[in-house]
Interface confidence: low
């Protein structure tokens, strides 16, 4: 027989010879990092037909690292489902917990023993320090010193000393989040008051009031013979200004001798040619808008509210 077969997990005991006599036996041992589990044979014999009797390295098993339990409030996930050397163990903490230590450990061979590259991490509960205090306001649970994951606090504004109230700007509720950080910045409390919105040749159709505080919403329509230049709905923003700006009602001009451009009967926000009704800026039209069923325009001899689509 020629040289005996070679294997990934086991190696020949002694030096190989160029050839072997019939009946001659060779023995193998498990390589470093592998261990033998009986009963499979780890030897072979040169057979009468000049071939080696079948043998495999199935009896040699890769050294495995010690079993790692799931950390408390977390999970240990073998990266490819095995504890054998050369592979990784990933650690994940359950929601509401964070990892202290290495996120990945490696199963390494030290001498002939497989050991983990480090100490398994632990999962600690996510805790937050008290949320910020705000001027002219307060939050719930102000006496609590430590907050747990997803614990929430709600802010409210103090009564104002003057005639106008403090408005809460931002989200009133925040919660203790993933990285021991509050979910968002604390809101603020301040007086927000927008000027009375006057639209000549038009009128409010919703949001009536004498004073307009934060988030007050007003909707307008134009008198007959006028069209809206700007947005029909405006909101009082945190800077005490209307957003978008207060619209104008512009006079519909008499028809010119030239034919007006055709307007589609369906409104699309992606339309490149905007009608005057949807135009917030740009040159004023010099033609009379058509008096069709185009949304936002009155039909002949009808009030605007009747024709709103």
């Amino acid at each position: 027989c020629e040289e005996p077969p070679t294997f990934e997990a086991m190696e020949l005991i002694g030096k190989p010879k160029p050839y072997y006599e019939i009946g001659e036996r060779v023995d193998y041992k498990c390589k470093k990092g592998y261990f033998y589990i009986p009963p499979l044979a780890t030897h072979t014999i040169c057979d009468r037909n000049h071939t080696w009797l079948p043998v495999s390295d199935d009896a040699c098993y890769r050294e495995t690292c010690p079993y790692i339990r799931d950390p408390l409030n977390g999970q240990a996930v073998p990266a490819n489902g095995t504890y054998e050397f050369g592979y990784q163990m990933h650690f994940i903490c359950n929601e509401g917990y964070y990892l202290i230590g290495e996120e990945i450990l490696y199963c390494e061979l030290k001498g002939s023993v497989a050991i983990w590259s480090g100490k398994p991490p632990i999962c600690e509960k996510v805790l937050c320090t008290p949320p910020p205090k705000i001027k002219n306001g307060k939050h719930t649970f102000s006496e609590v010193e430590v907050f747990e994951y997803l614990d929430a606090v709600t802010y409210s504004c103090d009564p104002a000393p003057g005639p106008d109230p403090f408005s809460l700007i931002g989200e009133s509720t925040i919660y203790c989040g993933d990285n021991s950080v509050w979910s968002r910045a604390a809101p603020e409390c301040k007086v927000v008051k927008c000027r009375f919105p006057v639209v000549e040749n038009g009128k409010q159709i919703s949001g009536f009031g004498k004073k307009f505080y934060y988030k007050a919403t007003v909707m307008f329509e134009c008198d007959k013979g006028f069209y809206l230049d700007g947005s029909d709905t405006i909101v009082c923003d945190s800077n005490s200004t209307w957003d978008p700006p207060v619209p104008k009602c512009l006079k519909v001009l008499p028809p010119s001798s030239t034919k007006p451009p055709a307007l589609s009967h369906s409104v699309s926000t992606s339309s490149t040619t905007k009608s005057p009704a949807s135009s917030a800026s740009g040159p004023r039209p010099t033609y009379k808008p058509p008096v069709s069923n185009y949304p936002g325009y009155p039909k002949p001899e009808e009030g605007i509210l009747d024709s709103l689509d």
Partner: antibody, heavy 116, light 109 residues
Framework: QVQLVQSGGGVVQPGRSLRLACAAS????????MHWVRQAPGKGLEWVAV????????YYADSVKGRFTISRDNSKNTLYLQMNSLRAEDTAVYYC?????????WGRGTLVTVSS | QSVLTQPPSVSGAPGQRVTISCTGS?????????VHWYQQLPGTAPKLLIY???NRPSGVPDRFSGSKSGTSASLAITGLQAEDEADYYC?????????FGGGTKLTVL
């Protein structure tokens, strides 16, 4: 509220494809290993596939290897199971489940019927 | 044929104690992998009952307990109640594969 909402089941012919979805709320799927488990009518549970928390490792049961693909879209917080070359024996209720070694949260399941 | 073997059915009268066995091999339970138990009430999704051999998730009554020894594990239910009637599955792991037992139907007489 922590839950898994499943969609995408239905009746399909052998050899055709189907995609199941599992939308998570109350937690983020990319913090956890996520699994698909199925249950044929009147039978027991059979594990189908898993995707590791980082998405780099995917494992499949031998019965679906090469035909099914597990994936997820972190921006949509959703887990998917793309099922190709479906066979009659794939008929089952498919559950998505959260967790590594064990499944601590399950979807309600979606029925997939493979029939000509 | 499931790799983890469970009895197809067990039964008991209200108030009694029943156990459900789960037998594996040296490549799964015997290799040190944890055993978990799930309860599946009729027409519903499975629910985690015991994890890591003997731990109960919050909300699971202490009438349910788990144990593991060698290549097998068992689930014990004491003070049996009518609402415990369900299918019970054990689960473990082997290289790259999550395993389930064939399931045991518990009947409360």
């Amino acid at each position: 509220q922590v839950q898994l909402v499943q969609s995408g089941g239905g009746v399909v012919q052998p050899g055709r494809s189907l995609r199941l979805a599992c939308a998570a709320s109350g937690f983020t799927v990319n913090n956890y290993a996520m699994h698909w488990v199925r249950q044929a009518p009147g039978k027991g549970l059979e594990w189908v596939a898993v995707i590791s928390y980082d998405g780099n490792n995917k494992y499949y049961a031998d019965s679906v290897k090469g035909r099914f693909t597990i994936s997820r879209d972190n921006s949509k917080n959703t887990l998917y199971l793309q099922m190709n070359s479906l066979r009659a024996e794939d008929t089952a209720v498919y559950y998505c489940a959260k967790g590594g070694g064990y499944f601590d949260l399950w979807g309600r399941g979606t029925l997939v019927t493979v029939s000509s | 044929q499931s790799v983890l073997t469970q009895p197809p059915s067990v039964s008991g009268a209200p108030g009694q104690r029943v156990t459900i066995s789960c037998t594996g091999s040296s490549s799964n339970i015997g290799a040190g992998y944890d055993v978990h138990w799930y309860q599946q009430l009729p027409g519903t999704a499975p629910k985690l009952l015991i994890y890591g051999n003997n731990n109960r998730p919050s909300g699971v009554p202490d009438r349910f307990s788990g144990s593991k020894s060698g290549t097998s594990a068992s689930l014990a239910i004491t003070g049996l109640q009518a609402e415990d009637e369900a299918d019970y599955y054990c689960s473990s792991y082997t290289s790259g594969t999550w395993l389930f037992g064939g399931g045991t139907k518990l009947t409360v007489l």
